[in-house]
Protein backbone atom coordinates (compact mmCIF):
# COMPACT_ATOMS: atom_id res chain seq x y z
CA UNK A 1 0.00 0.00 0.00
CA UNK A 2 1.25 3.61 -1.43
CA UNK A 3 1.28 6.13 1.68
CA UNK A 4 -1.07 9.17 0.49
CA UNK A 5 1.89 12.09 -0.18
CA UNK A 6 0.85 15.36 -1.62
CA UNK A 7 2.18 15.61 -4.95
CA UNK A 8 5.64 17.22 -5.25
CA UNK A 9 5.43 20.76 -7.37
CA UNK A 10 5.00 20.82 -11.35
CA UNK A 11 4.82 16.63 -11.32
CA UNK A 12 1.17 16.55 -11.48
CA UNK A 13 0.31 14.15 -14.52
CA UNK A 14 -1.52 15.79 -17.46
CA UNK A 15 -1.50 13.03 -19.58
CA UNK A 16 0.15 9.39 -19.60
CA UNK A 17 2.90 8.88 -20.98
CA UNK A 18 6.84 7.61 -20.98
CA UNK A 19 7.72 10.38 -18.47
CA UNK A 20 5.93 8.47 -15.68
CA UNK A 21 8.25 5.68 -15.63
CA UNK A 22 10.45 7.17 -13.55
CA UNK A 23 7.80 8.34 -11.39
CA UNK A 24 8.52 6.55 -7.97
CA UNK A 25 5.37 4.48 -6.59
CA UNK A 26 4.50 7.37 -3.97
CA UNK A 27 4.37 9.73 -6.91
CA UNK A 28 2.40 7.90 -9.31
CA UNK A 29 -0.30 7.55 -6.12
CA UNK A 30 0.00 11.21 -5.48
CA UNK A 31 0.01 12.66 -9.09
CA UNK A 32 -1.63 10.36 -11.43
CA UNK A 33 -5.51 11.09 -11.79
CA UNK A 34 -7.82 7.96 -11.39
CA UNK A 35 -9.87 9.36 -13.97
CA UNK A 36 -7.02 10.53 -16.64
CA UNK A 37 -6.09 6.61 -16.44
CA UNK A 38 -9.03 5.42 -17.22
CA UNK A 39 -9.27 7.60 -20.15
CA UNK A 40 -6.10 6.81 -20.92
CA UNK A 41 -5.81 3.05 -20.38
CA UNK A 42 -4.67 2.45 -24.01
CA UNK A 43 -1.89 4.22 -23.61
CA UNK A 44 -0.39 2.13 -20.70
CA UNK A 45 0.30 -0.60 -22.26
CA UNK A 46 2.87 0.49 -24.89
CA UNK A 47 5.05 2.22 -21.59
CA UNK A 48 7.21 0.25 -19.52
CA UNK A 49 5.55 -0.09 -16.70
CA UNK A 50 7.48 -1.93 -13.71
CA UNK A 51 4.80 -4.39 -12.55
CA UNK A 52 5.27 -2.46 -9.02
CA UNK A 53 4.34 0.43 -11.60
CA UNK A 54 1.10 -1.07 -12.58
CA UNK A 55 0.11 -2.36 -8.80
CA UNK A 56 0.00 1.60 -7.92
CA UNK A 57 -1.95 1.90 -11.13
CA UNK A 58 -4.43 -0.96 -10.50
CA UNK A 59 -5.06 0.48 -7.02
CA UNK A 60 -6.01 4.01 -8.51
CA UNK A 61 -8.72 2.12 -10.76
CA UNK A 62 -10.07 -0.10 -7.94
CA UNK A 63 -10.33 3.18 -6.19
CA UNK A 64 -12.75 4.78 -8.69
CA UNK A 65 -14.81 1.38 -9.65
CA UNK A 66 -14.95 -0.05 -6.41
CA UNK A 67 -17.50 -2.10 -7.89
CA UNK A 68 -15.73 -3.76 -10.41
CA UNK A 69 -14.12 -1.41 -13.75
CA UNK A 70 -16.25 -0.85 -17.10
CA UNK A 71 -15.55 -2.89 -20.16
CA UNK A 72 -13.99 -0.10 -21.78
CA UNK A 73 -10.89 0.17 -19.31
CA UNK A 74 -11.16 -3.57 -19.06
CA UNK A 75 -10.12 -3.83 -22.83
CA UNK A 76 -7.24 -2.00 -22.44
CA UNK A 77 -5.91 -3.31 -19.32
CA UNK A 78 -2.56 -4.87 -21.68
CA UNK A 79 -0.62 -6.20 -19.07
CA UNK A 80 -2.45 -4.63 -15.59
CA UNK A 81 -4.86 -7.37 -16.35
CA UNK A 82 -1.74 -9.84 -15.01
CA UNK A 83 -2.17 -7.70 -11.88
CA UNK A 84 -5.73 -8.94 -11.49
CA UNK A 85 -7.18 -11.34 -8.67
CA UNK A 86 -10.22 -14.09 -9.77
CA UNK A 87 -11.78 -11.49 -7.26
CA UNK A 88 -11.93 -8.44 -9.17
CA UNK A 89 -12.55 -10.23 -12.53
CA UNK A 90 -15.80 -11.81 -10.63
CA UNK A 91 -16.98 -7.92 -10.49
CA UNK A 92 -16.59 -7.48 -14.14
CA UNK A 93 -19.27 -7.85 -17.03
CA UNK A 94 -17.38 -8.56 -20.32
CA UNK A 95 -19.55 -8.90 -23.12
CA UNK A 96 -17.03 -8.33 -26.15
CA UNK A 97 -15.19 -10.95 -27.80
CA UNK A 98 -12.65 -7.91 -28.80
CA UNK A 99 -12.09 -7.53 -25.09
CA UNK A 100 -11.52 -11.09 -24.42
CA UNK A 101 -9.18 -12.00 -27.41
CA UNK A 102 -7.37 -8.52 -26.12
CA UNK A 103 -6.87 -10.03 -22.65
CA UNK A 104 -6.08 -13.53 -23.90
CA UNK A 105 -3.46 -11.93 -26.06
CA UNK A 106 -1.51 -10.84 -22.76
CA UNK A 107 -1.00 -14.25 -21.41
CA UNK A 108 -0.21 -15.76 -24.91
CA UNK A 109 1.99 -18.15 -24.61
CA UNK A 110 1.77 -18.76 -20.63
CA UNK A 111 -0.07 -21.84 -19.50
CA UNK A 112 -4.16 -20.63 -18.17
CA UNK A 113 -3.57 -18.81 -15.48
CA UNK A 114 -6.39 -18.27 -12.55
CA UNK A 115 -7.13 -15.15 -13.55
CA UNK A 116 -8.02 -16.11 -16.96
CA UNK A 117 -10.10 -18.92 -15.82
CA UNK A 118 -12.32 -16.79 -14.25
CA UNK A 119 -12.30 -14.42 -17.13
CA UNK A 120 -13.25 -16.71 -19.62
CA UNK A 121 -15.92 -18.00 -17.04
CA UNK A 122 -17.08 -15.18 -16.68
CA UNK A 123 -17.77 -14.14 -20.47
CA UNK A 124 -19.08 -17.46 -21.08
CA UNK A 125 -21.82 -17.39 -18.58
CA UNK A 126 -22.46 -14.03 -19.66
CA UNK A 127 -23.02 -15.24 -23.31
CA UNK A 128 -25.56 -18.35 -22.22
CA UNK A 129 -23.67 -20.62 -24.14
CA UNK A 130 -20.63 -21.46 -25.76
CA UNK A 131 -20.47 -20.21 -29.49
CA UNK A 132 -18.62 -21.11 -32.39
CA UNK A 133 -16.58 -17.70 -32.41
CA UNK A 134 -15.74 -17.94 -28.52
CA UNK A 135 -14.93 -21.21 -28.97
CA UNK A 136 -12.29 -20.42 -31.49
CA UNK A 137 -11.18 -17.78 -30.00
CA UNK A 138 -10.45 -19.92 -26.66
CA UNK A 139 -9.03 -22.86 -28.59
CA UNK A 140 -6.45 -20.49 -30.71
CA UNK A 141 -4.99 -19.69 -27.38
CA UNK A 142 -5.88 -22.65 -25.09
CA UNK A 143 -5.53 -25.65 -27.89
CA UNK A 144 -6.75 -27.78 -24.34
CA UNK A 145 -9.52 -25.27 -23.59
CA UNK A 146 -11.96 -27.77 -24.90
CA UNK A 147 -10.93 -30.62 -22.22
CA UNK A 148 -10.64 -28.91 -19.55
CA UNK A 149 -14.55 -28.08 -19.79
CA UNK A 150 -16.93 -31.04 -17.55
CA UNK A 151 -19.16 -32.95 -19.34
CA UNK A 152 -21.97 -30.64 -17.92
CA UNK A 153 -20.41 -27.69 -19.13
CA UNK A 154 -19.71 -29.42 -22.28
CA UNK A 155 -23.62 -29.60 -23.02
CA UNK A 156 -23.89 -25.68 -23.74
CA UNK A 157 -21.68 -26.22 -26.74
CA UNK A 158 -24.16 -25.80 -29.38
CA UNK A 159 -23.36 -28.24 -32.35
CA UNK A 160 -22.85 -25.53 -34.71
CA UNK A 161 -19.84 -24.37 -32.42
CA UNK A 162 -18.01 -28.28 -33.06
CA UNK A 163 -16.77 -26.76 -36.85
CA UNK A 164 -14.19 -24.50 -34.64
CA UNK A 165 -12.71 -27.62 -33.02
CA UNK A 166 -9.44 -28.83 -34.44
CA UNK A 167 -8.35 -32.05 -33.59
CA UNK A 168 -5.38 -31.28 -31.34
CA UNK A 169 -8.17 -29.60 -28.90
CA UNK A 170 -9.39 -32.60 -28.50
CA UNK A 171 -5.94 -34.60 -27.23
CA UNK A 172 -6.70 -34.39 -23.67
CA UNK A 173 -10.09 -35.42 -23.65
CA UNK A 174 -11.52 -38.09 -21.58
CA UNK A 175 -14.07 -40.59 -22.63
CA UNK A 176 -16.87 -38.66 -21.01
CA UNK A 177 -15.76 -35.15 -22.58
CA UNK A 178 -16.30 -37.39 -25.67
CA UNK A 179 -19.56 -38.71 -24.88
CA UNK A 180 -20.75 -35.48 -24.55
CA UNK A 181 -18.91 -34.18 -28.18
CA UNK A 182 -19.54 -37.41 -30.21
CA UNK A 183 -23.00 -36.61 -30.65
CA UNK A 184 -22.69 -33.05 -31.52
CA UNK A 185 -20.35 -33.37 -33.94
CA UNK A 186 -22.32 -36.23 -35.49
CA UNK A 187 -25.24 -33.90 -35.67
CA UNK A 188 -22.67 -30.83 -37.39
CA UNK A 189 -21.30 -33.07 -39.70
CA UNK A 190 -24.46 -34.98 -40.76
CA UNK A 191 -24.60 -33.73 -44.73
CA UNK A 192 -21.16 -34.42 -45.57
CA UNK A 193 -20.28 -36.89 -47.95
CA UNK A 194 -18.34 -40.55 -46.75
CA UNK A 195 -15.23 -39.89 -46.89
CA UNK A 196 -15.09 -35.92 -45.56
CA UNK A 197 -17.14 -36.98 -42.69
CA UNK A 198 -15.14 -39.82 -41.77
CA UNK A 199 -11.80 -36.85 -41.77
CA UNK A 200 -13.95 -34.32 -39.52
CA UNK A 201 -15.83 -37.16 -37.32
CA UNK A 202 -12.27 -38.79 -36.48
CA UNK A 203 -11.24 -36.93 -33.17
CA UNK A 204 -14.39 -37.50 -32.14
CA UNK A 205 -14.43 -41.06 -32.89
CA UNK A 206 -13.60 -41.91 -28.91
CA UNK A 207 -17.71 -41.17 -27.70
CA UNK A 208 -19.04 -43.31 -30.79
CA UNK A 209 -21.36 -46.29 -30.04
CA UNK A 210 -21.45 -49.56 -31.48
CA UNK A 211 -23.85 -48.94 -34.21
CA UNK A 212 -22.18 -45.60 -35.76
CA UNK A 213 -18.47 -47.57 -35.81
CA UNK A 214 -20.84 -50.71 -37.79
CA UNK A 215 -21.76 -47.94 -40.48
CA UNK A 216 -18.43 -46.55 -40.51
CA UNK A 217 -16.88 -50.29 -41.29
CA UNK A 218 -19.63 -50.39 -44.41
CA UNK A 219 -17.97 -46.62 -45.81
CA UNK A 220 -14.25 -48.20 -46.19
CA UNK A 221 -12.93 -45.55 -44.00
CA UNK A 222 -9.65 -47.17 -43.38
CA UNK A 223 -9.78 -45.95 -39.74
CA UNK A 224 -5.78 -45.63 -38.21
CA UNK A 225 -4.99 -47.76 -35.18
CA UNK A 226 -4.30 -44.78 -33.01
CA UNK A 227 -7.65 -43.74 -33.77
CA UNK A 228 -9.37 -47.32 -33.30
CA UNK A 229 -7.73 -47.67 -29.67
CA UNK A 230 -9.02 -44.54 -28.71
CA UNK A 231 -11.96 -46.03 -29.10
CA UNK A 232 -14.46 -46.85 -25.84
CA UNK A 233 -13.91 -50.50 -25.51
CA UNK A 234 -17.54 -51.27 -24.79
CA UNK A 235 -17.99 -49.80 -28.36
CA UNK A 236 -15.62 -51.96 -29.54
CA UNK A 237 -16.49 -55.52 -27.91
CA UNK A 238 -19.51 -56.35 -29.91
CA UNK A 239 -17.52 -55.65 -33.42
CA UNK A 240 -16.81 -58.64 -35.75
CA UNK A 241 -13.71 -59.54 -36.56
CA UNK A 242 -15.19 -58.82 -40.88
CA UNK A 243 -16.73 -55.60 -39.54
CA UNK A 244 -13.44 -54.62 -37.73
CA UNK A 245 -11.35 -55.63 -40.91
CA UNK A 246 -13.45 -53.62 -42.95
CA UNK A 247 -13.42 -50.77 -40.55
CA UNK A 248 -9.30 -50.58 -40.16
CA UNK A 249 -8.69 -51.64 -43.63
CA UNK A 250 -5.00 -51.47 -44.37
CA UNK A 251 -4.31 -50.73 -40.70
CA UNK A 252 -5.78 -54.37 -39.48
CA UNK A 253 -2.06 -55.52 -39.19
CA UNK A 254 -1.39 -52.80 -36.26
CA UNK A 255 -3.71 -54.74 -34.35
CA UNK A 256 -1.14 -57.47 -33.35
CA UNK A 257 0.73 -55.02 -32.08
CA UNK A 258 -1.43 -53.64 -30.16
CA UNK A 259 -2.88 -57.28 -28.97
CA UNK A 260 -1.91 -56.43 -25.32
CA UNK A 261 -3.76 -53.14 -25.11
CA UNK A 262 -7.54 -52.15 -24.65
CA UNK A 263 -9.57 -52.21 -26.48
CA UNK A 264 -7.75 -54.81 -28.90
CA UNK A 265 -7.14 -57.34 -25.93
CA UNK A 266 -11.19 -56.76 -24.51
CA UNK A 267 -11.82 -57.37 -28.23
CA UNK A 268 -9.68 -60.73 -29.25
CA UNK A 269 -11.34 -62.69 -25.49
CA UNK A 270 -15.02 -62.24 -27.35
CA UNK A 271 -13.79 -63.01 -30.64
CA UNK A 272 -14.05 -66.48 -32.13
CA UNK A 273 -10.19 -67.84 -32.45
CA UNK A 274 -11.79 -68.92 -36.51
CA UNK A 275 -12.62 -66.05 -36.81
CA UNK A 276 -9.39 -64.20 -35.35
CA UNK A 277 -7.43 -66.54 -37.57
CA UNK A 278 -9.23 -65.83 -41.11
CA UNK A 279 -6.98 -62.31 -40.29
CA UNK A 280 -3.55 -64.44 -40.76
CA UNK A 281 -2.09 -62.13 -37.85
CA UNK A 282 -1.59 -64.14 -35.56
CA UNK A 283 -4.06 -62.84 -33.21
CA UNK A 284 -4.31 -65.53 -29.85
CA UNK A 285 -6.45 -65.23 -27.03
CA UNK A 286 -10.10 -65.81 -28.52
CA UNK A 287 -12.60 -68.23 -27.72
CA UNK A 288 -12.00 -72.28 -28.86
CA UNK A 289 -14.03 -73.46 -31.15
CA UNK A 290 -16.64 -75.42 -29.92
CA UNK A 291 -17.44 -72.97 -26.65
CA UNK A 292 -20.80 -71.60 -26.53
CA UNK A 293 -20.74 -67.58 -25.35
CA UNK A 294 -23.56 -66.39 -23.52
CA UNK A 295 -24.23 -62.26 -23.35
CA UNK A 296 -25.51 -62.30 -19.49
CA UNK A 297 -25.29 -58.30 -19.97
CA UNK A 298 -28.08 -59.03 -22.93
CA UNK A 299 -29.95 -61.88 -20.31
CA UNK A 300 -30.18 -59.19 -17.68
CA UNK A 301 -31.28 -56.63 -19.52
CA UNK A 302 -34.21 -59.23 -20.41
CA UNK A 303 -35.02 -60.54 -17.15
CA UNK B 1 12.06 -17.37 -13.47
CA UNK B 2 14.63 -15.26 -14.51
CA UNK B 3 18.24 -14.66 -12.84
CA UNK B 4 20.09 -11.60 -13.10
CA UNK B 5 23.88 -11.11 -12.37
CA UNK B 6 25.44 -7.55 -12.22
CA UNK B 7 29.37 -6.62 -12.81
CA UNK B 8 31.53 -4.32 -13.22
CA UNK B 9 31.12 -1.72 -9.94
CA UNK B 10 33.85 -0.46 -8.23
CA UNK B 11 35.57 2.89 -7.36
CA UNK B 12 36.38 5.74 -9.68
CA UNK B 13 37.46 8.91 -10.41
CA UNK B 14 35.01 11.90 -11.12
CA UNK B 15 34.69 12.39 -15.04
CA UNK B 16 35.90 8.77 -15.69
CA UNK B 17 34.11 6.22 -17.15
CA UNK B 18 31.83 2.19 -16.10
CA UNK B 19 30.53 -0.06 -18.04
CA UNK B 20 28.11 -2.24 -15.62
CA UNK B 21 26.53 -5.54 -17.24
CA UNK B 22 23.95 -7.51 -16.32
CA UNK B 23 23.37 -11.52 -17.43
CA UNK B 24 20.14 -12.77 -17.75
CA UNK B 25 19.34 -16.24 -17.53
CA UNK B 26 16.84 -18.63 -17.23
CA UNK B 27 13.26 -17.70 -18.66
CA UNK B 28 14.20 -14.92 -20.72
CA UNK B 29 11.69 -14.90 -23.72
CA UNK B 30 9.54 -13.67 -21.43
CA UNK B 31 10.91 -10.69 -20.51
CA UNK B 32 9.17 -7.07 -21.89
CA UNK B 33 11.69 -4.70 -20.64
CA UNK B 34 14.87 -4.28 -18.65
CA UNK B 35 16.52 -1.61 -16.89
CA UNK B 36 19.07 -0.29 -14.27
CA UNK B 37 17.60 1.66 -10.99
CA UNK B 38 20.06 2.62 -8.45
CA UNK B 39 20.00 3.96 -4.75
CA UNK B 40 21.82 6.27 -3.23
CA UNK B 41 22.60 5.63 0.70
CA UNK B 42 19.66 6.68 2.37
CA UNK B 43 17.59 7.65 -0.43
CA UNK B 44 14.40 5.80 -2.43
CA UNK B 45 15.84 3.84 -5.35
CA UNK B 46 15.31 5.48 -8.73
CA UNK B 47 15.33 4.45 -12.14
CA UNK B 48 18.06 5.52 -14.47
CA UNK B 49 17.45 4.06 -17.83
CA UNK B 50 14.89 1.56 -19.26
CA UNK B 51 15.34 -0.53 -22.81
CA UNK B 52 12.38 -2.62 -24.05
CA UNK B 53 12.82 -5.34 -26.59
CA UNK B 54 12.63 -3.69 -29.39
CA UNK B 55 15.15 -1.54 -28.51
CA UNK B 56 13.76 1.99 -27.32
CA UNK B 57 15.30 3.41 -24.55
CA UNK B 58 14.16 5.80 -21.85
CA UNK B 59 16.75 7.81 -19.72
CA UNK B 60 16.05 9.80 -15.99
CA UNK B 61 17.05 13.60 -17.03
CA UNK B 62 19.76 13.43 -14.38
CA UNK B 63 21.34 10.94 -16.78
CA UNK B 64 20.90 11.95 -20.26
CA UNK B 65 23.96 12.18 -22.57
CA UNK B 66 25.77 10.37 -19.98
CA UNK B 67 24.68 7.28 -19.53
CA UNK B 68 23.74 4.92 -22.45
CA UNK B 69 21.98 2.18 -22.01
CA UNK B 70 21.87 -1.29 -24.59
CA UNK B 71 21.34 -5.06 -24.83
CA UNK B 72 23.76 -7.70 -26.91
CA UNK B 73 20.23 -10.42 -27.16
CA UNK B 74 22.83 -12.75 -28.41
CA UNK B 75 24.50 -12.72 -25.35
CA UNK B 76 21.67 -12.10 -23.27
CA UNK B 77 23.38 -9.20 -21.54
CA UNK B 78 21.99 -6.20 -20.66
CA UNK B 79 24.63 -3.27 -20.60
CA UNK B 80 24.75 0.62 -18.98
CA UNK B 81 27.57 2.46 -20.21
CA UNK B 82 28.13 5.39 -17.85
CA UNK B 83 30.76 8.48 -18.78
CA UNK B 84 31.20 11.63 -17.12
CA UNK B 85 30.57 10.15 -13.54
CA UNK B 86 29.92 12.65 -10.92
CA UNK B 87 29.74 11.97 -6.98
CA UNK B 88 26.08 12.14 -6.96
CA UNK B 89 25.87 8.76 -9.19
CA UNK B 90 27.88 6.74 -6.29
CA UNK B 91 24.77 4.03 -5.58
CA UNK B 92 24.02 0.57 -5.88
CA UNK B 93 23.09 0.18 -9.28
CA UNK B 94 20.25 -2.85 -9.77
CA UNK B 95 19.57 -4.43 -12.83
CA UNK B 96 15.60 -5.43 -13.30
CA UNK B 97 13.99 -7.37 -15.63
CA UNK B 98 10.13 -6.95 -16.37
CA UNK B 99 8.66 -10.52 -17.03
CA UNK B 100 5.72 -12.46 -17.40
CA UNK B 101 3.87 -11.71 -15.07
CA UNK B 102 6.75 -9.90 -12.21
CA UNK B 103 9.68 -7.96 -11.83
CA UNK B 104 13.06 -9.33 -11.40
CA UNK B 105 15.64 -7.74 -9.65
CA UNK B 106 19.74 -8.64 -9.19
CA UNK B 107 21.38 -8.64 -6.03
CA UNK B 108 23.24 -4.94 -7.10
CA UNK B 109 26.65 -3.82 -8.10
CA UNK B 110 28.35 -0.94 -5.29
CA UNK B 111 29.32 2.00 -7.88
CA UNK B 112 31.57 4.49 -5.86
CA UNK B 113 32.44 7.99 -7.53
CA UNK B 114 35.42 9.36 -5.61
CA UNK B 115 38.65 11.39 -6.39
Known amino acids: EVEKTACPSGKKAREIDESLIFYKKWELEACVDAALLATQMDRVNAIPFTYEQLDVLKHKLDELYPQGYPESVIQHLGYLFLKMSPEDIRKWNVTSLETLKALLEVNKGHEMSPQVATLIDRFVKGRGQLDKDTLDTLTAFYPGYLCSLSPEELSSVPPSSIWAVRPQDLDTCDPRQLDVLYPKARLAFQNMNGSEYFVKIQSFLGGAPTEDLKALSQQNVSMDLATFMKLRTDAVLPLTVAEVQKLLGPHVEGLKAEERHRPVRDWILRQRQDDLDTLGLGLQGGIPNGYLVLDLSMQEALS | EVQLVESGGGLIQPGGSLRLSCAAS????????MGWHRQAPGKERELVATITTVGTTYYANFVKGRFTISRDNSKNTLYLQMNSLRAEDTAVYYCRATAHPTDYWGQGTLVTVSS
Open chain 2, 26 to 33: GNIGSIRH
